[in-house]
């Protein structure tokens, strides 16, 4: 089948990084500068993505693969392939349509993106509050109130190794 196809369509022999040049008797020509073809048999090369402004280059364009962008410091990616950069806020804030806004009492945000999350309600799991929450940090739940009888010592929990929320780009 492959042999038959290549006899019928000489373009199928053109590898990634080239295009089938109709102007030159369908021979395989290399992609021009700032263009690429990621699959074989293409009749044109695609223009390389340019990472400008708030975008910065994460991976340079090559003859076989497009450039990849991420965002400059103070911004984060949204959308497939980082199609958009959105501004960061500070921890303890959320980004609204009117800009960064402090978390309301009873909520927190330990990230530079996203919205403020309600504090954990320790009592729902029969526990007590060991460390109060802030705008930047959730409450820390301790043992159940019954376990904290007079004379019982409360143990400070070890610092968390890693807080949820550090999603790789």
């Amino acid at each position: 089948f492959e042999r038959t196809r290549s006899l019928q369509d000489p373009c199928s022999n053109c590898p990634a990084g080239t295009f089938c040049d109709n102007n030159r008797n369908q021979i395989c020509s290399p992609c021009p500068p700032n263009s690429f073809s990621s699959a074989g048999g293409q009749r044109t090369c695609d223009i390389c993505r340019q990472c400008k402004g708030v975008f910065r280059t994460r991976k340079e364009c090559s003859s076989t693969s497009n450039a990849e962008c991420d965002c400059t410091p103070g911004f984060h990616c949204l959308g497939a392939g980082c199609s958009m950069c959105e501004q960061d806020c500070k921890q303890g804030q959320e980004l609204t349509k009117k800009g960064c806004k402090d978390c309301c009492f009873g909520t927190f945000n330990d990230q530079k993106r996203g919205i403020c999350r309600p504090w954990t309600n320790c009592s729902l799991d029969g526990k007590s509050v060991l460390v109060n929450g802030t705008k930047e940090r959730d409450v820390v739940c301790g043992p159940s109130p019954a376990d904290l009888s007079p004379g019982a010592s409360s143990v400070t929990p070890p610092a968390p190794a890693r807080e949820p929320g550090h999603s790789p780009q």
């Epitope: 309600p118 959730d138 190794a161």
Partner: antibody
């Protein structure tokens, strides 16, 4: 690659409890909140709650408070959802789903679902 | 608690454009996510934060959100798009942070 694999189907009597597990792989389990969502036959999706696998902190939908308990075992990268005092209208497919790393975005990876049937 | 309202069904011919709405008070101030749900399959996130597509979701699927209505748009609809679609938001209130719409069945004629 990220995978969430749930425990198998369960049949329970009214008044009993069920515990569904969700084993995570392909990412740092303690780095991402885990949510539980259910779908009863012919009904829509219903959010039940979340757990922070790092701290064990939880938040439950008001409807399930007092009946649901979400826990985790970080040594085996597994989250659990236990629902007690089961009723026939708890018959549903229960899903675990991962939050993508910050609150306010969509749930990006889902388990295959666990059918829980409550019948006398 | 916050309520999201979706039409029970939307019908569209192959190749046409389907629009599925999600209504809620000042929903334009929230970030809306959309999931595709097929029978016996887990939900799939198709749009997040109003208008962004995860990797692998085709460009013909898009979202918008303003005022009291968010919209999921599927252009050049195919038979494989037939599914239930759910909108969803997060709240900062502690009694019910996660809210789903009732779902819309997309019917391909």
């Amino acid at each position: 690659q990220v995978q969430l694999v749930q425990s198998g189907a369960e049949v329970k009597k009214p008044g009993a409890s069920v515990k569904v597990s969700c084993k995570a792989s392909g990412y740092s389990f303690t780095g991402y909140y885990m949510h539980w969502v259910r779908q009863a036959p012919g009904q829509g999706l219903e959010w039940m709650g979340w757990i922070n696998p790092n701290s064990g902190g939880t938040n439950y939908a008001q409807k399930f408070q007092g009946r649901v308990t979400m826990t985790r075992d970080t040594s085996i990268s597994t989250a659990y959802m236990e629902l007690s005092r089961l009723r026939s209208d708890d018959t549903a497919v229960y899903y675990c789903a991962r939050e993508p790393g910050y609150y306010g975005s969509g749930l990006d990876y889902w388990g295959q679902g666990t059918l829980v049937t409550v019948s006398s | 608690s916050y309520v999201l309202t979706q039409p029970p069904s939307v019908s569209v011919a192959p190749g046409e454009t389907a629009r599925i709405t999600c209504g809620g008070d000042d929903i334009g101030d929230k970030r809306v996510h959309w999931y595709q749900k097929k029978p016996d399959q887990a939900p799939v996130l198709v749009v997040y934060e109003d208008r962004y597509r995860p990797s692998g979701i085709p460009e013909r699927i898009s979202g918008s959100n303003s005022g009291n209505t968010a919209t999921l748009t599927l252009s050049r609809v195919e038979a494989g798009d037939e599914a239930d679609y759910y909108c969803q938001v997060w709240n900062s209130s502690s009694d019910h942070p996660g809210v789903f719409g009732g779902g819309t069945q997309l019917i391909i004629l």
